[in-house]
């Protein structure tokens, strides 16, 4: 335990005096948190919590779920904590199987262990398939794998986590990794025609075409020198991954000389905006 | 235990907005997706969109996009939503949801939009 | 989109029978064998409850007599035997691809 100056509030005590734990499953948890002040215990895993106001904490027929950590909070916010692995051969990982990445950051495979002694925490493709050859990650068995610098090329990836058991190799069920891209570039844009002449009453109608790499990108139809938003009809589609298209139709049914005018197509996305413009000329 | 609270009711006037929250505990609030739903007796249950734990990044169905605005407070664990310009056709339940492990394994009780004159 | 088509859109069901819910996927909603596919429950002034995921697991706390079936663009959601306590309204949900989307759902009935 932390030395602390006499006077001064201390963190709780916990029996076991360990920082990691290992029962075996179907054996007792049994935890002691001492302290004056107690307030509770706390057990966290896979970023899940739950509470305990009892300063024992006692788990008659541990599961491979009781895995995580337990953590003693007192009345002055000080705490202490101890990991305990619940080892089941039957269980060698807890999972969440959500796996999203955005694209150059870092993500977390969550496939913590019940069993810190197992060999070789790695990840593997699935159905035997290498994974890509820049892939890097860093394991942590109390936390899951953490993919470092995610790339576009990881989309839709399907992966295991795996550990080495007496020689055999263990996989975890599948994850499919979800790549979130990262904008680039500003989005592409155009318009169906430069200019247009018409008469009064006749219909005016201009499409827009916005690409980018996926539908996060903003794009709206403005008058020029007004920063009211036209009403637009939109389509869109993904024409494959990071390949996303929207269509944005102005319409003006009974189109007059006041109409007249610039019209301005204007999208954005994080990485900066850009616009195109339609002249259109009512004359009577 | 992992909890979501909504506010059970909101009546707002059309033309105005409305920004609904949903107060989580139980779980690391940056640590999980959070999904919005809306339902109506005639559309059944619609994607409104996500905001993925972490960096807030948000992806939306485009049916509500512009209409719909998904934000999070990281200190007081509450995902909001607001939605703007308000018509009738935005009269509905609106349902938080945890995803977690691939699906939606936590809701909220969810808010009921009332727009009225 | 990816449009769900729940059938039937109501059906009743006598006590202790069996009840057959499908829904239909305008296309895969396969990841190499996962199926982003999950049935949920409602019960009026609820919230829908997450009954299966992955088109055939069985949620945490859900009895054994739900269960899920299916791959790619079909998938059934069977109640055996059914209680009076399962009347309800149940919807199909894909999140293999934005935008995420639920079948219309179906009206169980007992009979």
């Known amino acids: 335990q932390p030395s602390v100056s006499p006077g001064e509030p201390s963190p709780p005590s916990i029996h076991p005096g360990k920082s990691d734990l290992i029962v075996r499953v179907g054996d007792e948890i049994r935890l002691l948190c001492t302290d004056p002040g107690f307030v509770k215990w706390t057990f966290e895993i896979l970023d899940e919590t739950n509470e305990n106001k009892q300063n024992e904490w006692i788990t008659e027929k541990a599961e491979a779920t009781n895995t995580g950590k337990y953590t003693c909070t007192n009345k002055h916010g000080l705490s202490n904590s101890i990991y305990v692995f619940v080892r089941d051969p039957a269980k060698l990982f807890l999972v969440d199987r959500s796996l999203y990445g955005k694209e150059d950051n870092d993500t977390l495979v969550r496939c913590p262990l019940t069993d810190p002694e197992v060999t070789n925490y790695s990840l593997k493709g699935c159905q035997g398939k290498p994974l890509p050859k820049d892939l890097r990650f860093i394991p942590d068995p109390k936390a899951g794998i953490m993919i470092k610098s995610v790339k576009r090329a990881y989309h839709r990836l399907c992966l295991h986590c795996s550990v080495d058991q007496e020689g055999k190799s263990v996989l975890s069920e599948k994850f499919i990794l979800k790549v979130r891209p990262a904008f680039k570039a500003v989005p592409v844009v155009s318009v169906s025609k430069a200019s247009y002449l018409l008469r009064e009453g006749e219909e005016f109608t201009v499409t827009c075409t916005i690409k980018d790499v996926s539908s996060s990108v903003y794009s709206t139809w403005k008058r020029e020198n007004s920063q009211t938003k036209l009403q637009e009809k939109c389509n869109s589609w993904h024409h494959g991954d990071f390949n996303y298209e929207r269509q944005a139709t102005l319409t003006i049914s009974s189109a007059r000389v006041n109409d007249s005018g610039v019209f301005m197509c204007y999208a954005n996305n994080t990485f900066g905006s850009a616009n195109v413009t339609t002249t259109l000329e009512v004359v009577d | 235990q992992v909890q979501l609270q909504q506010p059970g009711a909101e009546l707002v006037k059309p033309g105005a907005s409305v920004k609904m929250s949903c107060k989580a505990s139980?779980?690391?609030?940056?640590?999980?997706?959070m999904h919005w739903v809306k339902q109506t007796p005639g559309q059944g249950l619609e994607w409104i969109g996500v905001i993925y734990s972490g960096n807030g990044d948000t992806s939306y169905n485009q049916k509500f996009k512009g209409k719909a605005t998904l934000t999070a407070d990281k200190s007081s664990s509450t995902a909001y939503m607001q939605i703007n310009s308000l018509t009738s056709e935005d009269s509905a339940v609106y349902y938080c949801a945890r995803e977690r492990d691939t699906r939606f394994g936590n809701w909220g009780q969810g808010t009921l939009v009332t727009v009225s004159a | 989109n990816i449009v769900l088509t729940q059938s039937p859109a109501s059906l009743a069901v006598s006590l202790g029978l069996r009840a057959t819910i499908s829904c239909r996927a305008s296309e895969s909603v396969d990841i190499y064998g996962n199926s982003f596919m999950h049935w949920y429950q409602q019960k009026p002034g609820q919230p829908p409850k997450l009954l299966i995921y992955?088109?055939?697991n069985l949620e945490s706390g859900v009895p054994a007599r739900f269960s899920g079936s299916g791959s790619r663009t079909d998938f059934t959601l069977t109640i055996d035997p059914v209680e009076a306590d399962d009347a309800a309204t149940y919807y199909c949900q894909q999140n293999n691809e934005d935008p995420y989307t639920f079948g219309g759902g179906t009206k169980l009935e007992i009979k």
């Open positions: 992955l088109a055939s």
């Open positions: 139980g779980y690391t609030f940056t640590s999980y997706n």
